[in-house]
C-alpha cells in the first residue's frame, strides 16, 4: 500500500510519479559538471564543490540543506618531493626509477591539481633492501609463503598486486610479516580483460596507470585522531603515534609498465603454483631478492607523504516528513575523488542529484513524503570514510533513536552486465518486490522486469529462482550507520559479469583514466544503467520513506541466521576432537536462531492484522521493525574492533570489502589449529558462541508482544 | 482449523511435467516455511523441497535439484511444485506439509492428505 | 539413501513398552531439533514428536521423545493395537541445507 491516504496527498504522488520524474539526461549532465576537475578531500575545490551542491540542492526544493564540518587527519605527496621507487645497484645508483605521474588522458593535459599517484596516509621513509613477491599479499599467501615455502618476509620490501582484498589489509599482513615496505602494483591479469582497448581507446588499463587509495586499517574508527568522537572544534586529538589504524612502514603504488621492471628480475623461488601468476611476461620468482646478475642490485623506496590536519565538508539536505518526522531515512554518497571521479563517486553522485531533484519537484507541487528523508554528500570516503563516520558520531544519539535506514550511493556502475545488491536481510523483500516493477534496460529483456534480467544473470548460490543479494562488508560509506549504529542499510549498482571478468573492480579505478569520458564513451552511452540504479535507490528510498508498515521483513532474517549458523556449525565441525575435548556446543545459538524464527513468524501474523487506522499501534509495529536491527548491535564490540559492533555481521578481519557472518565466531575459529594455547582459544570460541546466542535471543525479544 | 488440500496428480510419461498445488487455509500461510514430501509405493518418507516464508528461499533435495521447483503465491495461500524431466523413480504420493516453527523448516505439524503422481510409459 | 537410520521393525504385546533409535550424524542430529512421525496404513504422516522431546496437544504421554549426541530414540509405553504404523524420526541437516527422515520403523502389536 502506498501512504497516499496518510499524508493525504493527490494519489498522483506515488512512486511512479517520483520514478518518473528521473531521467536519464539529467544524470548525465550532472556527471558531466562533476568531473571537469578533481575534487580531492580536503582542497579547496571539493569545498566548492559541495558549496555548488548545496545551493543547487536548495533550488531543487529541499526544505534545508547545511555543510557539517569536521578537521582529520589526511594525507597528501609532497609537491617539492615527489614520491618513487628506485633499483639501486651495489654503489647505490639509481639505476631504474619508477614514474612520478600517469600520463594525463587526452584534454586533460592541462588540468592542474591532479594528484600523484600514493598511498594515502604511508609514513615517511627510505627503505631499501630485497624484494620478495607476495602475491595478492592475502593471510592464506602469507600463510603459503611462511609455512609452507619457509621463505621469510622480515626486514625485506614486498611487492603485492593489487585485488581480491582491499589494500589495506595487505599492508597490515605485511607489516605483520616483518616487512619494511611494500609496493602495489596492477597486474593485467587482474586489471585488463582481454579483447579490450586500453583507455582512451576502451576501458582497460593503461601500463601507466596506478590505482591511489588509502592503507589503513581503522576498523570502523573514523578520523584517526578522535575515534569514537567528532572531529570538531573542541576535539582532543591523540598524538599521532597513538593514532589509530596508520601504516608503520612505507607504501606506494605502481602500475604494470613499472612493475614489469621490477618483477622481471626476482630470483629465488618459483611460485608455488599458476594461481600465483599474472599476465605479465616474468618469472613471478618469489624470491627473496634479484636473480643472478642483478643480485648485488636493491629495491629503495622514496617516500615523503605528510599527513595534516585539514577541514572537510559534508553537505546535508533535509526533506521534512509529514507524518513522522523523527524518523529518518538517508541516502548518502561521497563527493571527493582521487581524481576526476568519473565513476567513483561521481557517477553515484550525480544520481543522487537527480534523485534530489525528482523529490524536490514532487515537495514543490505539494507532496512530502511520511518520514523525513536525509540527504548526505560526504566528505573524505577515500581517507577511510571519515565525513560520513564523523557525521555520524556527532548525531550518534540522533540516529539510534530516529534511524530508519541509510542506503548508500557511491559509484552507480562498476559494470554494465546486471545489478549488484547487498544489504540488510530485512531488505531483501523491499529490493525483490522493487525490481520486480522496474524494467530491465539490459540487451534481450525488453518489456521483462530488472529482477528478470537480474536473476538470469546473478542468480543466488543457495536458493534458486532468486537474484543473488551480498552480506554488507565496508570500505563504504555505510559502514558506520550498519555496523556502528545498527541501522538497516543497503546499496544497489550495475556490475560486471563476474563469471568471465575475473578482474578485481573495474580497470581503472582510482586512477587519472575515471574519466566522464570513460563513462559516457565505454560504460553507459545512454546513461540508462545509470537511470536504472536512480530507479533503485531513490524506489528504495521512496518506499522506506513513504510506506505506513516499514518495508522490512523479519522472517527473512530469520531464513538467513539459520544459514549462518548451519555454516559457521560447520567450520566448528571441521575440528571434532577438539569440540569434544573442550565440550564446545552451538546448542544454545540454534535455540536462539529457532526461539527468533518462531517469534519473528508471530510478529509478522500480527503485522498483517492489526489495525493500521491506530497511530499508536502503527507507531509500535514499526518501532519494533526498526529497532531489530538496532537489537543486533553489541554495546562492546567485537574483539579489538570496538566500532564494529554488529553481532551477525562484520567486515572481515582479512578483508575490509567482504563481510563475514558471526564475525566473532568465525575469528575465534579462524587458523585455530595453530594457536599456542588451545584451550584458551575454545574458551573463546565458546565465548563468542555464548554473544552470539544471547545477542539472537535478546533481538528475537524485541519482536515479541510488548505486555 | 488448519487445511492443506494437494491436487494436480496423475499420470505422465518419463520425461514429462505434472505441476502440484497445495490450497492452504486456517493459517498464516506467508509466515510459514512449506514442505513438499513424497513417498513412493511401500517405501519410506522422502523430503522433496521446502520454501520459507518471507521471500520464499528454496530448497532441494540432491535427487530433484534442476529439475522440481517450488513456488508460493502467499495472497491466494497456495503452494506449487513445478515437476520437469520425470523419472519412473520420481513415482510417489507427494504431500504438501507445513512448518511447525515459522520461515524455515523445522518439523512438519500439518500435512495434506497426498496426491499420487506416476510415471510411466 | 536416507542420512538417518532405523531399525526396519521392533515388536512388542500389548501393554509393553517399545523404543525405536534413529541414528545421524554431527550435522543433523548432533546441531538440530528432531520430530517423528506416525504413520498408520494408508494415512498421511501425523507429527508425534517435535523438538526432541515435546508433545503437539492430543498426543498422549505415553509417548515420549530423547535425544544424546547423534542419536534419537522415540519410546512407546502401554502398547496398543492402534500404534500398529510406520514411525519416522525427521531434522534439518547443517551441511546439506536440506530435511532428512529416518529409513523409518514398523512397528507391530504381538
Known amino acids: 500500500k502506498s501512504s497516499n491516504e496518510a499524508t493525504n496527498i493527490t494519489p498522483k504522488h506515488n512512486m511512479k510519479a517520483f520514478l518518473d520524474e528521473l531521467k536519464a539526461e539529467n544524470i548525465k549532465k550532472f556527471l558531466y559538471n562533476f568531473t571537469q576537475i578533481p575534487h580531492l578531500a580536503g582542497t579547496e575545490q571539493n569545498f566548492q564543490l559541495a558549496k555548488q551542491i548545496q545551493s543547487q540542492w536548495k533550488e531543487f526544493g529541499l526544505d534545508s540543506v547545511e555543510l557539517a564540518h569536521y578537521d582529520v587527519l589526511l594525507s597528501y605527496p609532497n609537491k617539492t618531493h615527489p614520491n618513487y621507487i628506485s633499483i639501486i645497484n651495489e654503489d647505490g645508483n639509481e639505476i631504474f626509477n619508477t614514474s612520478l605521474f600517469e600520463p594525463p588522458p587526452p584534454g586533460y593535459e592541462n588540468v592542474s591539481d591532479i594528484v600523484p599517484p600514493f598511498s594515502a596516509f604511508s609514513p615517511q621513509g627510505m627503505p631499501e633492501g630485497d624484494l620478495v613477491y607476495v602475491n595478492y599479499a592475502r593471510t592464506e599467501d602469507f600463510f603459503k609463503l611462511e609455512r609452507d615455502m619457509k621463505i621469510n618476509c622480515s626486514g625485506k620490501i614486498v611487492i603485492a598486486r593489487y585485488g581480491k582484498v582491499f589494500r589495506g589489509n595487505k599492508v597490515k599482513n605485511a607489516q605483520l610479516a616483518g616487512a619494511k615496505g611494500v609496493i602495489l602494483y596492477s597486474d593485467p591479469a587482474d586489471y585488463f580483460a582481454p579483447g579490450v582497448k586500453s583507455y582512451p581507446d576502451g576501458w582497460n588499463l593503461p601500463g601507466g596507470g596506478v590505482q591511489r587509495g588509502n592503507i589503513l586499517n581503522l576498523n570502523g574508527a573514523g578520523d584517526p585522531l578522535t575515534p569514537g568522537y567528532p572531529a570538531n572544534e573542541y576535539a582532543y586529538r591523540r598524538g599521532i603515534a597513538e593514532a589509530v589504524g596508520l601504516p608503520s612502514i612505507p607504501v606506494h603504488p605502481i602500475g604494470y609498465y613499472d612493475a614489469q621492471k621490477l618483477l622481471e628480475k626476482m630470483g629465488g623461488s618459483a611460485p608455488p603454483d599458476s594461481s600465483w601468476r599474472g599476465s605479465l611476461k616474468v618469472p613471478y620468482n618469489v624470491g627473496p631478492g634479484f636473480t643472478g646478475n642483478f643480485s648485488t642490485q636493491k629495491v629503495k623506496m622514496h617516500i615523503h607523504s605528510t599527513n595534516e590536519v585539514t577541514r572537510i565538508y559534508n553537505v546535508i539536505g533535509t526533506l521534512r516528513g509529514a507524518v513522522e518526522p523523527d524518523r529518518y531515512v538517508i541516502l548518502g554518497g561521497h563527493r571527493d575523488s582521487w581524481v576526476f571521479g568519473g565513476i567513483d563517486p561521481q557517477s553515484g553522485a550525480a544520481v543522487v542529484h537527480e534523485i534530489v531533484r525528482s523529490f524536490g519537484t514532487l515537495k514543490k507541487e505539494g507532496w512530502r513524503p511520511r518520514r523525513t528523508i536525509l540527504f548526505a554528500s560526504w566528505d573524505a570516503e577515500e581517507f577511510g570514510l571519515l565525513g560520513s563516520t564523523e557525521w555520524a558520531e556527532e548525531n550518534s544519539r540522533l540516529l539510534q533513536e530516529r534511524g530508519v535506514a541509510y542506503i548508500n550511493a557511491d559509484s552507480s556502475i562498476e559494470g554494465n552486465y546486471t545489478l549488484r545488491v547487498d544489504c540488510t536481510p530485512l531488505m531483501y523483500s523491499l529490493v525483490h518486490n522493487l525490481t520486480k516493477e522496474l524494467k530491465s534496460p539490459d540487451e534481450g529483456f525488453e518489456g521483462k522486469s530488472l529482477y528478470e534480467s537480474w536473476t538470469k544473470k546473478s542468480p543466488s548460490p543457495e536458493f534458486s529462482g532468486m537474484p543473488r543479494i551480498s552480506k554488507l562488508g565496508s570500505g563504504n560509506d555505510f559502514e558506520v550507520f550498519f555496523q556502528r549504529l545498527g541501522i538497516a542499510s543497503g546499496r544497489a549498482r550495475y556490475t560486471k559479469n563476474w563469471e568471465t571478468n575475473k578482474f578485481s573492480g573495474y580497470p581503472l579505478y582510482h586512477s587519472v583514466y575515471e574519466t566522464y569520458e570513460l563513462v559516457e564513451k565505454f560504460y553507459d552511452p545512454m546513461f540508462k544503467y545509470h537511470l536504472t540504479v536512480a530507479q533503485v535507490r531513490g524506489g528504495m528510498v521512496f518506499e522506506l520513506a513513504n510506506s505506513i508498515v516499514l518495508p522490512f521483513d523479519c522472517r527473512d532474517y530469520a531464513v538467513v541466521l539459520r544459514k549462518y549458523a548451519d555454516k559457521i556449525y560447520s567450520i566448528s565441525m571441521k575440528h571434532p576432537q577438539e569440540m569434544k575435548t573442550y565440550s564446545v556446543s552451538f546448542d544454545s545459538l540454534f535455540s536462539a536462531v529457532k526461539n527468533f524464527t518462531e517469534i519473528a513468524s508471530k510478529f509478522s501474523e500480527r503485522l498483517q492484522d492489526f489495525d493500521k487506522s491506530n497511530p499508536i499501534v502503527l507507531r509500535m509495529m514499526n518501532d519494533q521493525l526498526m529497532f531489530l536491527e538496532r537489537a543486533f548491535i553489541d554495546p562492546l564490540g567485537l574483539p579489538d574492533r570496538p566500532f564494529y559492533r554488529h553481532v551477525i555481521y562484520a567486515p572481515s578481519s582479512h578483508n575490509k570489502y567482504a563481510g563475514e557472518s558471526f564475525p566473532g565466531i568465525y575469528d575465534a575459529l579462524f587458523d585455530i589449529e595453530s594457536k599456542v594455547d588451545p584451550s584458551k582459544a575454545w574458551g573463546e570460541v565458546k565465548r563468542q558462541i555464548y554473544v552470539a546466542a544471547f545477542t539472537v535471543q535478546a533481538a528475537a525479544e524485541t519482536l515479541s508482544e510488548v505486555a | 482449523e488448519v487445511q492443506l488440500v494437494e491436487s494436480g496428480g496423475g499420470l505422465v510419461q518419463p520425461g514429462g511435467s505434472l505441476r502440484l498445488s497445495c490450497a492452504a487455509s486456517g493459517f498464516t500461510f506467508s509466515s510459514y516455511a512449506m514442505s513438499w514430501v513424497r513417498q513412493a509405493p511401500g517405501k519410506g518418507l522422502e523430503w522433496v523441497s521446502a520454501i520459507s516464508g518471507g521471500i520464499g528461499s528454496t530448497y532441494y533435495a540432491d535427487s530433484v535439484k534442476g529439475r522440481f521447483t517450488i513456488s508460493r503465491d502467499n495472497s491466494k495461500n497456495t503452494l506449487w511444485l513445478q515437476m520437469n524431466s520425470l523419472r519412473a523413480e520420481d513415482t510417489a504420493v507427494y504431500y504438501c506439509a507445513k512448518d511447525g516453527v515459522g520461515a524455515t523448516p523445522y518439523y512438519f505439524d500439518y500435512w495434506g492428505q497426498g496426491t499420487l503422481v506416476t510415471v510411466s510409459s | 539413501q536416507s542420512v538417518l537410520t532405523q531399525p526396519p521393525s521392533v515388536s512388542a504385546a500389548p501393554g509393553q513398552k517399545v523404543t525405536i533409535s534413529c541414528s545421524g550424524s554431527s550435522s543433523n542430529i548432533g546441531n538440530n531439533y528432531v520430530s517423528w512421525y506416525q504413520q498408520l496404513p494408508g494415512t498421511a504422516p501425523k507429527l508425534l514428536i517435535y523438538?526432541?522431546?515435546k508433545r503437539p496437544s492430543g498426543i498422549p504421554d505415553r509417548f515420549s521423545g530423547s535425544k544424546s549426541g547423534t542419536s534419537a530414540t522415540l519410546g512407546i509405553t502401554g502398547l496398543q493395537t492402534g500404534d500398529e504404523a510406520d514411525y519416522y524420526c525427521g531434522t534439518w541437516d547443517s551441511s546439506l541445507s536440506a530435511y532428512v527422515f529416518g529409513t523409518g520403523t514398523k512397528v507391530t502389536v504381538l
Open positions: 523438538d526432541n522431546n
